[in-house]
């Protein structure tokens, strides 16, 4: 096909691919009609003047995963049709000024995973048609004012995984078309008021894994189209009352891994599209009334691994669509009987690893659709009569690792458990803690007469039998609760950031595998 270098493969569709460690320079001659050229995994260390001079029809050029550390300013001369240029995963420390001059059609420029120390306004001043600029995974410490001023059509800018310690409030001011801005994994400690004011079309803002301590009250007030806001793994200790007030399109908000101590009522301003709220790994100690009342469509609320010791009875008001509530690994000792009353659609609740010593009899009264309840590792000695009677869909109930008191008062619970054993799982059954003579024996098979020989055991009405099979004709395996292997964070669905961590039994929320991703 018009001459293909021996080190390359050329396809009928004008695509050329040159790979292999033996390549140390741009192969020649390249087919004049090439529209896509990939130079991957070679030992090319530099690009000299005009190596692509004879392939002016080129639309896409990928020079990735090489040893490239030096580029001559005229390397891309005569590539006026080029729309996509990737120099990702090389060893570039410096970009020559004028390198992209003449690339009038360029829409995507990928410079990620190099060793770039700085960028200057002159670098991109010719790239007025650029829509995507990837600079993540470099060594940038600051972005000078004006660096992006000419990129008025830019829709995606990734500055993640650099060493940025501060951002000028003017650096993004001309990017009115920007839809995605990623600043994750830097060293930002604060973001000046007004930094995002010009980004009226922004849909995603990724600020996770920085060192941000405070958010300015009006930081997001101009970003009415924001849909995804990632603030996890920072040092945020408080949320200004109005910070989330003007984000009506938001459907994803992550705040896990911060230092939040409290949440004020209404802090989550009207967000009719928000489906998930991740607040685990903070220092929250209490939840006031109506704190989530604006989140009418919320389906997943993760509050695990905090220090919550008090939940106001109306804390969950408004969460009528909530399906999953994770409160595990907190400091709860008591729960008000009405605290879950508004959660009519709740399916899974995880309360394990708390200090609960008793539960009110009506705690699950209005939550008829519950499928999974995790109560293991608390300090429960007994449960109120009939607490689970109305839960016809309940198929997973975890009660182990509690100090069950196996006296005559435990009979109703024991009888119900006998009839509903499959719900308890086979791995771990609840065992008696007291009296000492029955310690360690299974609560389900314990002979209470042996446990309390001196007490006459009266006829106690047993918990009515509830068939353990769910109402639905079929029940997919994916809904079974697994608290041992689960995702520690929502998958922030980046094409360039897809790390998912799996942890041990201190994992995040003890909910279903299917839901946790």
């Amino acid at each position: 096909y018009h001459g293909c270098p021996s080190e390359c493969t050329c396809s009928r569709a004008s695509q050329v691919e040159c790979t292999g460690a033996r390549i140390v320079a741009v192969p020649t001659p390249l087919p004049w009609n090439a529209m896509s050229l990939q130079i991957l995994n070679t030992h090319i260390t530099e690009l000299n003047e005009s190596p692509f001079l004879n392939i002016s029809a080129l639309i896409a050029l990928r020079i990735e995963k090489n040893e490239l550390s030096r580029i001559t300013p005229g390397a891309f001369r005569n590539l006026g049709s080029l729309r996509y240029l990737s120099l990702a995963n090389n060893k570039l420390q410096v970009l020559p000024i004028g390198l992209f001059q003449g690339l009038d059609s360029l829409e995507s420029l990928l410079l990620s995973s190099n060793q770039l120390l700085q960028i200057q306004p002159a670098h991109f001043s010719q790239c007025s048609n650029l829509k995507e600029l990837q600079l993540h995974g470099n060594h940038l410490e600051y972005i000078p004012d004006g660096a992006f001023d000419h990129l008025v059509g830019l829709t995606k800018l990734n500055l993640g995984k650099n060493s940025l310690t501060h951002i000028s409030p003017r650096v993004f001011q001309h990017l009115g078309n920007l839809q995605v801005l990623r600043l994750y994994e830097n060293r930002l400690t604060d973001i000046p008021m007004g930094t995002f004011d010009g980004l009226v079309n922004l849909q995603e803002l990724a600020l996770q894994q920085n060192q941000i301590g405070l958010l300015s009250p009006g930081l997001f007030h101009n970003n009415h189209n924001l849909q995804r806001l990632y603030l996890s793994n920072n040092h945020i200790s408080q949320l200004p009352p109005s910070v989330f007030m003007q984000l009506p399109q938001l459907n994803r908000l992550t705040l896990f891994g911060n230092s939040l101590k409290e949440l004020s009522p209404g802090i989550f301003g009207p967000m009719p599209n928000l489906r998930e709220l991740w607040l685990y790994d903070n220092h929250i100690s209490s939840l006031p009334d109506n704190v989530f009342s604006n989140l009418r469509q919320l389906q997943v609320l993760i509050l695990s691994r905090n220090q919550i010791s008090f939940i106001s009875p109306g804390a969950f008001n408004g969460l009528t669509e909530l399906r999953e509530l994770s409160l595990h690994t907190n400091a709860l000792q008591d729960l008000d009987g009405n605290v879950f009353r508004m959660l009519a659609n709740l399916q899974n609740i995880s309360l394990q690893n708390n200090r609960l010593r008793q539960l009110p009899g009506n705690i699950f009264a209005n939550v008829n659709g519950l499928m999974a309840i995790q109560l293991q590792n608390n300090q429960l000695e007994n449960l109120p009569l009939g607490i689970f009677d109305h839960l016809g869909k309940l198929c997973e109930l975890r009660l182990y690792d509690n100090p069950w008191r196996c006296d005559s008062d435990i009979l109703p619970l024991r009888n119900w458990l006998l009839l509903n054993q499959p719900r308890l799982g086979t791995d771990t059954v609840p065992v008696c803690f007291s009296p000492a003579n029955v310690r360690g024996q299974s609560l389900i098979i314990i002979n209470v007469n042996v446990a309390v020989p001196s007490v006459h055991v009266p006829e106690v009405p047993s918990y009515p039998e509830t068939p353990w099979y769910p109402d639905t004709p079929s029940y997919p395996d994916t809904t079974s609760v697994s608290s041992t292997t689960e995702l520690t964070s929502p998958v922030e669905d980046y094409t360039d950031l897809t790390t998912i961590q799996v942890t041990d039994d201190r994992s995040v929320w003890g909910m279903t595998q299917a839901q946790s991703g």
Partner: antibody, heavy 120, light 112 residues
Framework: EVQLVESGGGLVQPGGSLRLSCAVS????????VHWVRQATGKGLEWLGV???????NYNSHLMSRLTISKENAKSSVYLQMNSLRAGDTAMYYC??????????????WGQGTTVTVSS | DIVMTQSPDSLAVSLGERATINCKSS????????????LAWYQQKPGQSPKLLIY???TRESGVPDRFSGSGSGTDFTLTISSLQAEDVAVYYC????????FGGGTKVEIK
Amino acid sequence: EVQLVESGGGLVQPGGSLRLSCAVSGFSLTSYGVHWVRQATGKGLEWLGVIWAGGSTNYNSHLMSRLTISKENAKSSVYLQMNSLRAGDTAMYYCATHMITEDYYGMDYWGQGTTVTVSS
Amino acid sequence: DIVMTQSPDSLAVSLGERATINCKSSQSLLNSRTRKNYLAWYQQKPGQSPKLLIYWASTRESGVPDRFSGSGSGTDFTLTISSLQAEDVAVYYCKQSYNLPTFGGGTKVEIK
């Protein structure tokens, strides 16, 4: 007779890790929880964590990121794994259980302890 | 975390005399529903492992001599040895289990 015997102590380099064992007899780990407590020489007691009969764990919040407690019921052994050791982790490490006390977090049977020294 | 503060650090008492050790918690250890104070006292003799003496602030562990008694509620607790014996020379620790356990710094009891 109820017994708890710790082992695995010794000299560890700063930054290294340790894995201590607690071999129990006279009771089953499927029925009783086991705590780990440490004590620096001449200092007070510090609770590290517990693994309950069903395998749930609780940890000292200050040490949680460096600690893992696990067990093998069939071997009647409980393990304490501690990473990123520093000089301040030098101590006697005890395991203990709640055999007859009515206090769920009470520790009425203790091992004799194993000494860990963190030094270069 | 709940902080436990013991006083005094050390105490010298004559044989047969009363010894009183105080323990203060940074928050209440009383659970209003169970009506229990989640406080325990331990004794540790030189070269030995600790021994549980008292739990729920005032319940003596079986086998513990009745000269040991515990009292108090909420945030202030006391361990009293009504008539000190030679074998009572030890360090005494309070421990809360209202939240995940924390120990006090210890009080050393010696014979005057």
